[in-house]
Amino acid sequence: DAHKSEVAHRFKDLGEENFKALVLIAFAQYLQQCPFEDHVKLVNEVTEFAKTCVADESAENCDKSLHTLFGDKLCTVATLRETYGEMADCCAKQEPERNECFLQHKDDNPNLPRLVRPEVDVMCTAFHDNEETFLKKYLYEIARRHPYFYAPELLFFAKRYKAAFTECCQAADKAACLLPKLDELRDEGKASSAKQRLKCASLQKFGERAFKAWAVARLSQRFPKAEFAEVSKLVTDLTKVHTECCHGDLLECADDRADLAKYICENQDSISSKLKECCEKPLLEKSHCIAEVENDEMPADLPSLAADFVESKDVCKNYAEAKDVFLGMFLYEYARRHPDYSVVLLLRLAKTYETTLEKCCAAADPHECYAKVFDEFKPLVEEPQNLIKQNCELFEQLGEYKFQNALLVRYTKKVPQVSTPTLVEVSRNLGKVGSKCCKHPEAKRMPCAEDYLSVVLNQLCVLHEKTPVSDRVTKCCTESLVNRRPCFSALEVDETYVPKEFNAETFTFHADICTLSEKERQIKKQTALVELVKHKPKATKEQLKAVMDDFAAFVEKCCKADDKETCFAEEGKKLVAASQAALGL
């Protein structure tokens, strides 16, 4: 339904508070380096303009598209050229090319200072002094660091952030109340950002069909009692929502997400028995709850798929008539029967089935050709099952930190050209799969582990895309979305890699390491481990373990010393010499 003024339409639908928050998120995700005050000024100007359009939809410029209005506003920033360089060239383009240009300049790893958490009293004072500015600053800081963060979900995080401060700033022990809540929000926020980044990569790099296939599989697992037509409708609507958010159309995205939540709750009887509690919540909580809702129970009786997808004489006829619908039905039927499979495994099975039909439906005897298609699924199912079993055993044996180190060594040997910070970040996240998923019973391990690994490997892919250094990473990232994990798993040691020159400076440590948190100290040690492997890719596990044990002892010893800095200088030289000898450098 066409509206005379799109901006007025969205302002009325979303309300002033959400409108302003979403415009701020949109601007901060596009212009990631701009100061907070500049963004607030731009948002206020857009809001005032929107209000004039609400009052009179025929007013000047009110009929312009949101991209035109927002793009024009962003292009008024005086320092665009000096701050963003070639991104300023986007402003010479017309819509829709201008918006595409802005999207291409989003930076997954912007050069921004790490967010340092002030003292609790300082935060509480700032919160009480100006709650609105305090919360806007939160939106701004998260949005500019995570340019693909799912905007309506960020509103939910901001609501929880506000609730934490409201409650804890009046508590007897403010810190004990607030800090765990902020830690939880930070960890959940990073996870949410990474999950959304995969959705956007799926849409942008592999197209709508790839995203829809993912959505069919996931929603069929979650809503196994829903009819295929119902799942298809939800998939279409969900695809629209994510296409909008990934495309920077945050107002439309938030509005459509609210409509989708409303539809799901109005039709929960034909969707899932697990939605009742979610649907009683306010909008932001409701949408979040639906997105995280547990899988419904499977219908009591589901027949074998063989009759419709292997034994029927009409398989090729049904496939030819509507390929994607038939494959969608196959995926739906398979996924609703297998909540114990990862989505990516289900998509591999569907791809195998599609490839078989493409080949067999052109053969002399199609039925004879595809009769044993499900035998081809066995190795595809067993590969992730075995990998998860092995890695969970290793995790249980080593614990999280040492398991991360094993993965650091494994991945540095596979792709040593990748930057050390990226290898550390990605391997640490890969290692978290252990504590996240290995505690689950067998039936929940694979969907937990493999779908989580897809999210983490996508981080590697988007960071690598910014500055490509490894053909192997590019190949695994671009060839097939669903085979990324098997592709990386299959990589062996890169024999073509020329070891990095030894640089003693890399292994020089100072007393400041003693004041770091346990997590930051781990990152320092893991950074050193990656560098060691880059210098000596053929080093054995035993050699690396010996050096890392010496390193840990060295840090512990010097942090206990009276003159820490001298200890680090003198003992550090000895450690470097001993490590070189141990590794034959």
Epitope: M298, D301, P303, S304, A306, E333, R337, F374, V381, E382
Partner: nanobody, 124 residues
Framework: DVQLVESGGGVVQPGGSLRLSCAAS????????MGWFRQAPGKEREFVAA????????YYADSVKGRFTISRDNSKKTVYLQMNSLRPEDTALYYC?????????????????WGQGTLVTVSS
């Protein structure tokens, strides 16, 4: 967890009948697809028959269609395989299996729990 114990095997003449039973202990079987597989000496394990959770759907290997009937009694936690018109090629060790999730019924990798087997010999 589910423990499965098969019984009812034995020696029978060609054309004869046998009824195999599979008794489950531990968890209830109503949330499992139940199946029968068999393995003849020197051959791979092959699918025979399977039945959906509440018994509404059955599925058979082509080689036993019309001769074998699978059924279940969830209240007794037992699955049955009625085998009629037995042939020498039906000689095998017959295994009962339970799978919480199954798309195909016929694929052994979709089954989580297995019995030890009961021997069926068809010979004159």
């Amino acid at each position: 967890d589910v423990q499965l114990v098969e019984s009812g095997g034995g020696v029978v003449q060609p054309g004869g009948s046998l009824r195999l039973s599979c008794a489950a202990s531990g968890s209830t079987i109503s949330s499992y697809v139940m199946g029968w597989f068999r393995q003849a000496p020197g051959k791979e394990r092959e699918f025979v028959a399977a039945i959906s959770r509440s018994g509404g759907y059955t599925y058979y290997a082509d080689s036993v269609k019309g001769r074998f009937t699978i059924s279940r009694d969830n209240s007794k936690k037992t699955v049955y395989l009625q085998m009629n018109s037995l042939r020498p090629e039906d000689t095998a060790l017959y295994y009962c299996a339970a799978g919480r999730y199954s798309a195909w019924y016929s694929q052994s990798y979709e089954y989580d729990y297995w019995g030890q087997g009961t021997l069926v010999t068809v010979s004159s």
